[in-house]
């Protein structure tokens, strides 16, 4: 999505401000990073690897290369998500990880990618021959989604050395696009600052009417609920087809959250609320969201052995004490 | 050269879904990015979405604004084969629909940016 950003139009600086280098000074820096943020493309990136160590195991890792804030990540197999593919994950930022066998093990590896631990029956199992996909519901870009697949020789022995991810990758064009707006600002902003100095600052007059700006808080799960997000164990399935419909889910929609792969100790943000909300197999990630929250406190209709029950109707928060977030 | 053959168009009610695959012959280990452009009669050829990939397995797609999250491009484990799985179509995505493939490594949103194209697939959505 190519989106241009609204500059805001530079007021000639009020009296009261001038000491502090006026409006235009620091609105600029703003300008300039709201022009980083939003310039360029949105691209989903999906890489399956079969591990070296079992034979067994496959990772999938994903990730989101775009300015939005995360709001779901749900990764499927055997194709595209809402065209026959069978959900393996889905992990929302805030309300925790949900994942069914074969899916070993999913978390957040960063705020906008993500990590699947699948595990098969060798390199002859059906998964080796899957087109895994990873659909990332951002706001404001909307869903987008990317697959990928082992390579025809899985041969771990074979395979190319594991690479760092390509969480950091870009194109050349817009490093160095980026690199000359930042540049040209520090010039600009190096060049007010000297133009500040030579000029004697005005006695600084306390505004009465301007209340301090309230810092604004960039979207990001905090080190602890990233933490929290991490699922240690799972159910295991050793064949790599889909479990069965009573234990899994059809391909419409999922019996949502029935039996949530949790861990007391390490999980104080898992969802009983999310339990048993039916997902559209379609929609914009809006109605998806909608549809998790849409039963709040709801009790789920059966509890496998891993599922932590919160007893509070407002969910697992409420019971954090003094670090829980109201 | 890149031989590139698309199938899987035909007419689909709106809202409906349809795949389309793009099998490539020839050299094609040498394409690294793989891309999906239309052409509505009396229009420009526009893109809709490319789907490139790097020497550790690693698949990368991006997508025209208009797609907002219905179609999904992607290739099948043998690198021969590309797909464009197109969900909620609507009426405006009819078109002739082309597979082309760039031999050079890049995030490529021009047609001139490929240098092998398909003969083209027809879509026709109707209402």
């Known amino acids: 999505m190519r989106t241009e950003a609204q500059v805001p139009a530079l007021q000639p600086p009020e009296p009261g401000l001038e000491g502090a280098m006026g409006h235009r000074t620091l609105v600029l820096p703003w300008v300039l990073l709201t022009l980083c943020v939003t310039a360029g493309t949105p691209e989903v990136w999906v890489q399956v690897r079969m591990e070296a160590t079992e034979l067994s195991s496959f990772t999938i890792r994903c990730g989101f290369l775009g300015s939005g804030s995360i709001s779901l990540v749900t990764v499927s197999w055997g194709g595209p998500n809402g065209a026959g593919g069978t959900t393996l994950a889905v992990l929302h930022p805030e309300r925790g990880i949900r994942q069914w066998a074969p899916a070993r093990q999913a978390r957040w590896e960063t705020q906008s990618s993500i990590s699947l631990i699948l595990e098969g029956s060798g390199a002859s199992s059906p998964c080796a021959n899957t087109t895994f996909c990873c659909k990332f519901a951002s706001f404001p870009e909307g869903s987008w989604e990317a697959c990928g697949s082992l390579p025809p020789s899985s041969d771990p022995g074979l395979s190319a050395p594991p690479t760092p991810a390509p969480i950091l990758r870009a194109d050349l064009a817009g490093i160095l696009g980026v690199s000359g707006v930042l540049l040209f600002g520090c010039v600009y902003l190096l060049h007010l600052l000297r133009r500040h100095k030579h000029r004697p600052a005005p006695r600084l007059q306390p505004s009465r009417t301007s209340p301090q700006a309230p810092r604004a808080r960039a979207w990001a799960p905090s080190q602890a609920s990233q933490a929290a997000l991490h699922v240690p164990y799972a159910t295991i399935n050793t064949s790599c087809r889909p479990a069965t419909l009573d234990t899994a889910h059809p391909h419409g929609g999922p019996s949502w959250w029935a039996s949530l792969p949790t861990h007391a100790a390490h999980r104080p943000q898992g969802p009983a609320a999310w339990a048993s909300t039916p997902i559209p197999a379609r929609g914009s990630f809006v109605s998806v969201e909608n549809g998790l929250y849409a039963q709040a406190g709801e009790r789920p209709p059966h509890t496998g052995p891993g599922l932590t029950l919160f007893p509070d109707p407002r969910g697992p928060r409420a019971m954090e004490g003094p670090l829980g977030v109201r | 050269q890149v031989q590139l053959v698309e199938s899987g168009g035909g007419l689909v009610q709106a809202g409906g879904s349809l795949r389309l695959s793009c099998v490539a012959s020839?050299?094609?280990?040498?394409?690294?990015?793989m891309a999906w452009f239309r052409q509505a009669p009396g229009k420009e050829r526009e893109f809709v979405a490319y789907?490139?990939?790097?020497?550790?397995?690693?698949?990368?797609?991006s997508y025209a604004d208009f797609v907002k999250g219905r179609f999904t491009a992607f290739r099948d484990n043998t690198r021969n084969t590309m797909y464009l799985q197109m969900n909620r179509l609507r009426p405006e995505d009819t078109a002739v629909y082309y597979c082309?493939?760039?031999?050079?490594?890049?995030?490529?949103?021009?047609?001139?940016?490929?240098?092998?194209w398909g003969q083209g697939t027809q879509v026709t959505v109707s209402s």
């Open positions: 789907t490139r990939w790097t020497d550790d397995n690693t698949d990368y797609a």
């Open positions: 082309a493939a760039a031999t050079t490594r890049g995030t490529y949103y021009s047609a001139g940016d490929y240098n092998s």
């Open positions: 020839g050299r094609t280990f040498s394409a690294n990015t």
